[in-house]
Every structure is written in C-alpha cells, then in structure tokens.
C-alpha cells in the first residue's frame, strides 16, 4: 500500500491496538456537486429489467434508511413490452459501509459494518436455461 | 424520527455541538454472511448492457479502493449479439458513505463523505431519440 506521512496536527491517539477506534466527523461532505443522482431516478421504470425500491429502516444504523431494489420480473421486457423468460432480470449488488451504534442506542459510538445492497437490476443471458 | 433511549453504558461525549464527532470502531463487522457477492461477479459480461470495472484508489479515503462501472456501449446488446442503438446502456448509480482523512494524512481522524458511484449498467428505453 501507499505510506502516507503523518500530519503533525493530527488528533492524538493513545490506543494503537485493534480494534482501532477513530474519531469521525458526521458533518457529511457531499462530493457529488457536478453530477445529479436524481438523473437516474426513472431508470427503475424504463429498464428492460425494471425494479421496485423498498425502504429498509433501522434506527441503530447510520444511515438509518437504505433503499433496496427488487427486480419486478424473472425475465426481461422485450420490444413488445412483454416479459421474455429467455433472459433474466438480476439484481446488481454492492457492498457498502454503514455505521452501527455500538453499544446499542449510543448516539456517539459506532462500529463500521459492511452490508450488501441491491442497487438496481440488469438483464443478463441465462447460464441455466429453464426455458426451452 | 424514532427516539432511542440512551444506553447508560455509552462512552461520554462532552461536545454536543455540530459538526458532531463520534467514535467509530474500524474493525468491520460483515453482515453478508449468507450472501455470495461473487455470484453477481459475471453479470458485467453477461448483461445486455455490459460494463467494465475501473479501480479508483485514494489513500486519503476509507475504503481506499472503490470499483467504478463504465458501460461498454452506448446501446444495448440484442439477441444477435450486436449493439442496438435504439436502446441505451446507462449506469446505475448509488450514493455511498466513505471516510475521508481529515486533517489530511491523519490515521485516526476522519470525516464522513458522500460520493456517487456507478455500480453497473442497465438497458433502458430512450427518452432522447438520437437514432432515427
């Protein structure tokens, strides 16, 4: 990996043992200034592998609300607007980091957690041919 | 929102002002035990809107490596294996949280940051008709 020279103005950290506890400023900086995430908000409906978005809420997690995609069909929508079962709608998944309150119900103490979320769906050629 | 009763065993936090600084344990807990993320690892190739994955590395960020999807084609792959420009390959984007070292180069001090990443691609019916 890349070795970064330590900034002498860093906050002091006495405990060098793992599990490593760090200070995190929750005042979020948004780097998405030149891209509009809402631009893709209608893809769930216009896709040949459309999906619905389900709200997953957990007050012990930060962010507390995550939207999960569920593909609407097993197959994909063809040019006639019908479901073609010779193709498969599948979820595109991504591992994301969230903060889990630890100990539970603590406002200022968290643990990093990795969760797998479905972001949307794509249409793929099947590897198992259920439809002759 | 939901009010959570405070756990009396929480670490003490004197500073109640925003920007809020919290303690985060970086020993990641992985909740994806019953899901195999590699299951979807070939979708990028089998999709009708295939994509390539580009490595984005930043040592000042945690995680330092993020994979970005770039759609391979403007159109989508049809049943004959050709690119059909009457349909559009588009990126499915998601806002994710990462930790940015702040001040820079500090190993134990971070700020939450929201970034937009392309996770994969999907095939959509066009709204802008470039192809007659």
């Amino acid at each position: 990996g890349i070795t970064i020279p330590r900034n002498p103005g860093c906050p002091n950290s006495e405990d060098k043992n793992f599990p490593r506890t760090v200070m995190v400023n929750l005042n979020i900086h948004n780097r998405n200034t030149n891209t509009n995430p809402k631009r893709s908000s209608d893809y769930y409906n216009r896709s040949t592998s459309p999906w619905n978005l389900h709200r997953n809420e957990d007050p012990e997690r930060y962010p507390s609300v995550i939207w999960e995609a569920k593909c609407r069909h097993l197959g994909c929508i063809n040019a006639d607007g019908n479901v073609d079962y010779h193709m498969n709608s599948v979820p595109i998944q991504q591992e994301i980091l969230v903060l889990r309150r630890e100990p539970p119900h603590c406002p200022n103490s968290f643990r990093l957690e990795k969760i797998l979320v479905s972001v949307g769906c794509t249409c793929v050629t099947p590897i198992v041919h259920h439809v002759a | 929102g939901i009010t959570i009763p405070r756990n009396p065993g929480c670490p003490n936090s004197e500073d109640k002002n925003f920007p809020r600084t919290v303690m985060v344990n970086l020993n990641i807990h992985n909740r994806n035990t019953n899901t195999n993320p590699k299951r979807s690892s070939d979708y990028y190739n089998r999709s009708t809107s295939p994509w390539n994955l580009h490595r984005n590395e930043d040592p000042e960020r945690y995680p330092s490596v993020i994979w970005e999807a770039k759609c391979r084609h403007l159109g989508c792959i049809n049943a004959d294996g050709n690119v059909d420009y009457h349909m559009n390959s588009v990126p499915i984007q998601q806002e994710i949280l990462v930790l940015r070292r702040e001040p820079p180069h500090c190993p134990n001090s971070f700020r939450l940051e929201k970034i937009l990443v392309s996770v994969g691609c999907t095939c959509v019916t066009p709204i802008v008709h470039h192809v007659a």
Epitope: - | K70, L74, P126, V128
Partner: nanobody, 123 residues
Amino acid sequence: QVQLVESGGGLVQAGGSLNLSCVISRRTPSGYAMGWFRQASGKEREFVAAISWIGGGAVYADSVKGRFTMSRDNAKNTVYLQMNSLKPEDTAVYYCNDMPYGLDTTMDDYDYWGQGTQVTVSS
C-alpha cells in the same frame, strides 16, 4: 472539474473537410462516452455525434450521418470529429463533452462547457 479543449475549426468551402479534436484534461472522464455538439448563431445547442470510450461504437445525428466520423484515442484522452462534404448549414461553434449517461444524456445534465471551436462553411 474536467477541462475540455476543442481545436481544429476554421473557414472552409462547401464540400471541404475539417478534423476537430478535443482533449479531456482529467485522468479519466467521469462518463463512459463522449459527444460532439454544435450551436449555430441564434439556435439551440444540438447533438452531433457520440462515441463509447470502451466499445468504440459511434452514433450520429441524422443531419451528419455518412459525412462525419467520430473516433477516440483512449491513451491520449482525446476524441476526434472528421467532417467531410461540409455544407453551409454545418456552420456553428462545435463543442465536445463527457456524456455521463451515454445516449440518455440531455443538455440539462451539463453545467460546464469548453470554449468550443468555430467552423464556418462558405458557399
């Protein structure tokens, strides 16, 4: 911020040719496609052509199909527009830009343009 530098424009007679180039000064463009657009005096900016960085397939507006060819050089982060059989109605300022949503990109998705390069076709 991505920087776009277009060049290669000029004054040419009808039936002549020009080759425009556009250099993107960022390690990797944010999108997966690049486009050429043009804006004639007093008219709205319009799509001319687009190309995929990876696949290399290009798409053209009906008005330029068969006359213009778009290509790209990934190593140089540069795209080109070879314009043949030019017509007076091709007179415009030509711009290139990243297409973050490929063919789904609309003019509303842009908040930044380069300075463009003027193409003038005389009859």
